[in-house]
């Protein structure tokens, strides 16, 4: 999906009002210095591309974050404010339902969410290019 035509300000507002708080809740009890950020992003479409991939793609040691509250709100924000996003996600959602597992908060998931926080912060930088 090409995130170039999203309403970035509306997505930013959604992040600031709710998604950021859900990320903090997920990370509660973890020191902010515990994980090194190893990925970043260049401009807003890039940030959303990486946020989408990191939130919804299973990775080694962290099978799925997709049912977490921050993930569901991220998905809703992208569906509302990125034209055509929902249509591209139908197949991905069906595949995800098939492999859904019991929610377990592993250290790897905490590290992944820490990376997500960094990507979202970068998305919200005032000087970041729209595209």
């Amino acid at each position: 999906y090409d995130f170039t035509n999203c309403d970035f300000e509306k997505i930013k507002a959604a992040y600031l009002s709710t998604i950021s708080k859900d990320l903090i809740t997920y990370m509660s009890g973890t020191k902010s210095t515990e994980f090194n950020n190893t990925v970043s992003c260049s401009n807003r479409p890039h940030c959303l591309t990486e946020i989408q991939s990191l939130t919804f793609n299973p990775t080694a040691g962290c099978a799925s974050l997709a049912k977490e509250m921050f993930a569901m709100k991220t998905k809703a924000a992208l569906a509302i404010w990125c034209p055509g996003y929902s249509e591209t996600q139908i197949n991905a959602t069906q595949a995800m339902k098939k492999r859904r597992k019991r929610k377990v908060t592993t250290n790897k998931c905490l590290e992944q969410v820490s990376q997500l926080q960094g990507l979202w912060r970068r998305f919200n930088r005032p000087l970041l290019k729209q595209q």
Epitope: V39, S40, P45, T49, E50
Partner: antibody, heavy 117, light 108 residues
């Protein structure tokens, strides 16, 4: 300390596919960062080709996108480059590098690929 | 595509002298700029990122400055091992990260 090592054929015929592999030691490619390919034609500057992130997102230089595929094999801690329909203009030293998806902090030593019949 | 123009193409200096290298972007890249050093037959090495932050293990004689379209890499006092080619790279314009054409710092 992370180390990267490129491998693959040094000579490729025009119109064929260039295939290179980067073997990473000292760091798991599924643990963090992105893993990138960059090339440098002899005596010229650097050109970014693309990356694959540790969680699988892939990004390509638009000027090469139609010909490039980057993939990974986490069991071998390797990532690979395929460049199709090569011409003499694709003759270059090809580097693999670790990236935070912005800049490149660790590089392989590079491998020269010549496109010639 | 953002074009980076480096100047001069070649800089002839003696050890101990100060080197000032320029990189100009065709449009603003904010502070999203890195500098690399490349010696003959070797891979590039990251020196500076975010326009002015030194990478791990880089000596303090290397410093970067600038924002927007004009950037400078300064080597305060050239050591013999500093004679090399230097490249700037912008990462403001994903997915079109670009490098400058390079500045060669040679022994006078």
């Amino acid at each position: 300390q992370v180390q990267l090592q490129e491998s693959g054929p040094g000579l490729v015929k025009p119109s064929e596919t260039l295939s290179l592999t980067c073997t990473v030691s000292g760091y798991s490619i599924s643990s963090g960062y992105g893993w990138s390919w960059i090339r440098q034609p002899p005596g010229k500057g650097l050109e970014w080709i693309g990356y694959i992130s540790y969680y699988g997102s892939i990004s390509y230089n638009p000027s090469l996108k139609s010909r490039v595929t980057i993939s990974r094999d986490t069991s071998k801690n390797q990532f690979s480059l395929k460049l199709s329909s090569v011409t003499a203009a694709d003759t270059a030293v090809y580097y693999c590098a670790r990236t935070n998806l912005l800049y490149f902090d660790s590089w392989g030593q590079g491998t020269l690929v010549t496109v010639s019949s | 595509e953002i074009v980076l123009t480096q100047s001069p193409a070649t800089l002839s200096l003696s050890p101990g002298e100060r080197a000032t290298l320029s990189c100009r972007a065709s449009q603003s890249v904010s502070n999203n700029l890195a500098w690399y050093q490349q010696k003959p037959g070797q891979a590039p090495r990251l020196l500076i990122y975010d326009a002015s932050s030194r990478a791990t293990g880089i000596p303090a004689r290397f410093s970067g400055s600038g924002s927007g379209t004009d950037f400078t890499l300064t080597i305060s006092s050239l050591e013999p091992e500093d004679f090399a080619v230097y490249y700037c790279q912008q990462y403001s314009d994903w997915p079109q990260y670009t490098f400058g054409q390079g500045t060669k710092v040679e022994i006078k």
